[in-house]
Interface confidence: low
């Protein structure tokens, strides 16, 4: 708290301007009218105030707006945003994407701070869903943003927003997150032709079910091994040798290098050895010829 003291004669601020940088903290408190500050917030960013002086300015705004700042003030906070606590931000009602962009710009180049996380949370909750423009903005500032959301939060992402997602935005997503995002991507890209569709859906395939992989195998997509290795094991296991061959196209030769790794290793265990032999890759570990498979789900091969 800054002690209440009278403003010295002739020091009352009529404008928010550079002369204020020479004011002591108590003079700023006494001589700057909070309402004036609120209407001229856009000037604060251009003035090299010290952190201590910014503390005083924040204190004045807090007194003027105890229930939370109006958006007209928030949009022009600039570096004063860095002084806000998550508790302060929870009082705000930010609805304009321009306001969001302005505040994210202040934090640009830094990791997502608790303040930014709270701001984004307030903004998204205010909008009711993570629309395309918002997602576009957030992933531009924080490529890993999408994967920082819980599966529950991702469920509020409308399929139309998926168009804003770039492959690198999904780099750190775990399987549970891709399980939520994949059906949305499938819906978003459903009207594209085969090859274009595959280019767009590829990054999301870690959440794809078996039937979709079977469908892709009929479309000459030539999936690369890196994508194949990220597929859900339970989705890969039911695929036949012929389906995997069609799915991978010329990349099928890469299976040999991956034969000891999931999901390839587990898939091999489910295939007949004579089917595997048709690939000519020397893959070993399939069900011996002449064995009768009674229960594939148990991965048991009995004679």
């Amino acid at each position: 708290e800054v002690e209440k003291t009278a403003c010295p004669s002739g020091k009352k601020a009529r404008e928010i301007d550079e002369s204020l940088i020479f004011y002591k903290k108590w003079e700023l408190e006494a001589c700057v009218d909070a309402a004036l500050l609120a209407t001229q917030m856009d000037r604060v960013n251009a003035i090299p105030f010290t952190y201590e002086q910014l503390d005083v300015l924040k204190h004045k705004l807090d007194e003027l707006y105890p229930q939370g700042y109006p958006e007209s003030v928030i949009q022009h906070l600039g570096y004063l945003f860095l002084k806000m606590s998550p508790e302060d931000i929870r009082k705000w009602n930010v609805t304009s994407l321009e306001t969001l962009k302005a505040l994210l710009e202040v934090n640009k180049g830094h990791e997502m701070s608790p303040q930014v996380a709270t701001l984004i949370d307030r903004f998204v909750k205010g909008r009711g869903q993570l629309d395309k423009d918002t997602l576009d903005t957030l992933t531009a500032f924080y490529p890993g943003y999408l994967c920082s959301l819980s599966p529950e939060e991702l469920s509020s992402v409308p399929p139309s927003s998926i168009w804003a997602v770039r492959p690198q935005d999904l780099d750190t997503c775990d399987p549970r997150q891709l399980d939520v995002l994949y059906p949305k991507a499938r819906l978003a890209f459903q009207n594209m032709n085969g090859s274009e569709y595959f280019v767009k859906i590829q990054s999301f395939l870690g959440g794809a079910p078996t039937e979709d992989l079977k469908a892709l195998s009929q479309q000459n997509v030539s999936m690369d091994l890196a994508t194949f290795m990220k597929l859900r094991t339970d989705a890969v296991l039911p695929l036949t040798v012929a389906e995997v061959q069609k799915l991978l196209g010329p990349h099928v030769e890469g299976l040999k290098a991956e034969e000891r790794h999931r999901p390839v290793r587990d898939w091999i265990l489910r295939q007949r050895q004579d089917d595997l032999d048709t690939l000519g890759l020397g893959l070993q570990g399939g069900i011996p010829n002449g064995y009768l498979v009674l229960d594939l789900s148990m991965q048991e091969a009995l004679s």
Epitope: S150, C173, D179, R262
Partner: antibody
């Protein structure tokens, strides 16, 4: 029997670097697992550092790590290393490695190593 | 961020009594919660995963419950061997996380 064992713990100077190794034995390292590092300062609680997938290049780490710690793996050696740089006294702890089976059922660490002590002091 | 808050920090129990430890997540983590027991000089031991599933070889005196943000570990018929520190751990996500573990609860018997 499946086992994890950490090694490399030592007394190290502030601002120094150190690499810890987690060796997996009796464990098919080409299978799908996450090997994770967790530390515990003397008399304090458990603190998650990060995890590395034994096959894919996926690495996830706690937000406080900030690039100071790097997790790498060698499939042929069956090891996962934790390379620590710019060490401070606050990094003094017992460092454990633990295994999480790679599935869709959440993270939990069924198998732990005994731990290795790192002391940062001049 | 997903922060885990454990209460109480320590608790005393008589042999044969019951101990209840609570764990609160700052956001919903569904049922992705594990409980561990740790004794001095030893690594943690998994007791319960997915909020209520008992790990192999763990006594049925340990019971986990809860979902969403509120979870409970109950130890009934407390024995001397139960004296240890107990930790909860969220297994929901590893993205944008400071620590997956709660602060721990010391149990004195």
């Amino acid at each position: 029997q499946e086992q994890l064992e950490e090694s490399g713990g030592d007394l190290v100077q502030p601002e120094g670097s150190l690499t810890l190794t987690c060796k997996a034995s009796g464990l098919d390292f080409s299978s799908s697992y996450w090997i994770c590092w967790v530390r515990q300062a003397p008399g304090k609680g458990l603190e998650w550092i990060g995890c590395r997938h034994t096959f894919t290049a996926n690495t996830w780490s706690a937000s406080w790590v900030n690039g100071r710690f790097t997790i790498s793996r060698s499939t042929s050696l069956g090891t996962v290393d934790l390379k620590m740089t710019s060490l401070t006294a606050a990094d003094t702890a017992t460092y454990f490695c633990a295994r999480d089976e790679s599935n869709n059922d959440g993270w939990d660490f069924k198998l732990w190593g005994p731990g290795t002590l790192v002391t940062v002091s001049s | 961020a997903y922060d885990m808050t454990q209460t109480p920090a320590s608790v005393s129990a008589a042999v044969g009594g019951t101990v209840t430890i609570k764990c609160q997540a700052s956001q919903s983590i569904s049922n992705y919660l594990a409980w561990y027991q740790q004794k001095p000089g030893q690594p943690p031991k998994l007791l319960i995963y997915q909020a209520s599933t008992l790990a192999p070889g763990v006594s049925s005196r340990f019971k986990g419950s809860g979902s969403g943000t509120e979870f409970t570990l109950t130890i009934s018929g407390v024995e001397c061997a139960d004296a240890a520190t107990y930790y909860c751990q969220q297994g929901y996500t590893s993205s944008n996380v400071e620590n997956v573990f709660g602060g721990g609860t010391g149990v004195v018997v």
